[in-house]
């Protein structure tokens, strides 16, 4: 069954800034994400942001920036203007809708033990212990190294010192080691099956275009299920609506968002895909 996770973090740099991260774990395509605070949707919550995978984002104060992080996760930055931080005790909820299959919602809040100086990681104590262990380990290695050097110096006193030859093999080995990973990366880039982690390229298109077209972010949160939009839609008189095969509507007199069978509506960093665009009425 699909699940929704929510994580709330206090920013380390700005104590009045919070970030809500939400993600959807499960199959299916996401048609809308709603972020609220003070309770879930349908139980007295106040909307903060609404994110559509194709048409962009909308947000309300105190939300500062809502954006897609991946195809199935979002983040919302909040600016707390008040002197006393109301966000610290607030519940944030995220609802992922997949129309008409269903919707899933989950809530979360800032961990009560969060240090304002930290970004509230889920397990801060083990992280500190790891740092301490690292420092102690490094100290131990240095002490051991010093002792070993002293031991070598003592041995040098009792031995004649032979002439040292420069070691070419060592430098060659080092060069080869340094170059090999780079070569591997290059090969991976040319191999379509290589498992390299390429960066996701989310857009932050928050507004609709002045001519009435909604902004189209480059991160559709679903793979297309239906056919590409028909390219032969007629243009009618100004002010009327044109039904496109995929269920979106263009205002007549404007160019439809597709000009040929080979052109797709949502180009992004993962390559072309067909239009699904099933989420709106104009």
């Amino acid at each position: 069954t699909p699940e929704v996770w929510v994580q709330v973090q206090m920013e380390a740099t700005e104590l009045s800034s919070f970030t809500v991260h939400c993600g959807f774990l499960g199959p299916g395509s996401i048609s809308l994400v709603t972020v609220s605070w003070g309770g879930p949707d349908g139980a007295g919550g106040t909307k903060l942001a609404v994110l559509h995978p194709e048409l962009g984002t909308r947000q309300w104060a105190p939300a500062r920036q809502a954006r897609w992080e991946t195809q199935s996760s979002i983040s919302l930055a909040l600016e707390d203007s008040g002197a006393s931080s109301p966000f610290a005790n607030t519940t944030f909820c995220c609802k992922f809708a997949s129309f008409p299959e269903g919707s899933w919602e989950s809530c979360g809040s800032l961990p009560p033990s969060s240090d304002p100086g930290l970004s509230a990681p889920p397990t801060p104590v083990p992280i500190l212990r790891a740092d301490l262990a690292g420092i102690l380990g490094l100290s131990g290695v240095l002490l051991f190294g010093c002792g070993y050097l002293l031991h070598l110096l003592r041995r040098q006193k009792h031995r004649p010192t032979p002439r040292l030859q420069p070691s070419h093999t060592n430098s060659q080995a080092l060069t080869a080691q340094a170059w090999a990973p780079s070569q591997a990366s290059q090969a991976a880039l040319h191999d379509p099956y290589a498992t390299i982690n390429t960066s996701f390229c989310p857009a932050t298109l928050d507004t609709a275009h002045p001519n009435g077209w909604a902004s189209l972010p480059t991160h559709a949160a679903h793979q297309p299920q239906g056919p590409a939009a028909s390219a032969s839609t007629p243009i009618l008189a100004r002010g009327s609506f044109v039904s496109v095969e995929n269920g979106l509507y263009t205002q007549a007199g404007e160019r439809p968002p597709h000009t040929g069978p080979g052109l797709t509506l949502f180009p992004d960093c993962r390559g072309p895909r067909a239009v699904e665009g099933r989420f709106g009425v104009r």
Epitope: S31, L32, T34, S36, D41, G42, A43, G44, G45, K47, V50, H52, L55, G56, R58, K95, A97, F99, P100, S103, A208, H209, G212, W213, A214, S215, L248, Y249, Q251, F279, G280, V281, R282
Partner: nanobody, 120 residues
């Protein structure tokens, strides 16, 4: 819990009429739009009509002049009067409440749907 319950669907002959109703209950966000979507058998979802928060109705071209969307705020209900029905209007009709992106209404909540079959 937000609940949207559609009713009024059924079998009707071409040229006939039907009136769909949608009863909304439970707290909802101050959404921007309320409307109807439909899904014909084996086809994708299609927006039929919606009413913006400003009360202006909007229709898809294929239903203009035949369908009328209306609201009753007192009863917290939405209606779709469908006249001069055609075979291609056969679909499951969903009542939705949602948010506007430009002139689009993106569903945030919806009902279970009601089936409309136009056949002789």
């Amino acid at each position: 819990e937000v609940q949207l319950v559609e009713s009024g669907g059924g079998l009707v002959q071409p040229g006939g009429s039907l009136r769909l109703s949608c009863a909304a209950s439970g707290y909802t966000f101050s959404t921007d739009c309320m409307g109807w979507f439909r899904q014909a058998p084996g086809k994708g979802l299609e927006g039929v009509a919606h009413i913006d928060s400003d009360g202006i109705p909007r229709y898809v071209e294929s239903v203009k002049g035949r369908f009328t969307i209306s609201q009753d705020h007192a009863k917290n209900s939405l209606y779709l009067q469908m006249n001069s029905l055609r075979a291609e209007d056969t679909a499951v009709y969903y009542c939705v409440v949602g948010f506007k992106f430009g002139d689009y209404c993106a569903p945030n909540d919806w009902g279970q749907g009601t089936m409309v079959t136009v056949s002789s």
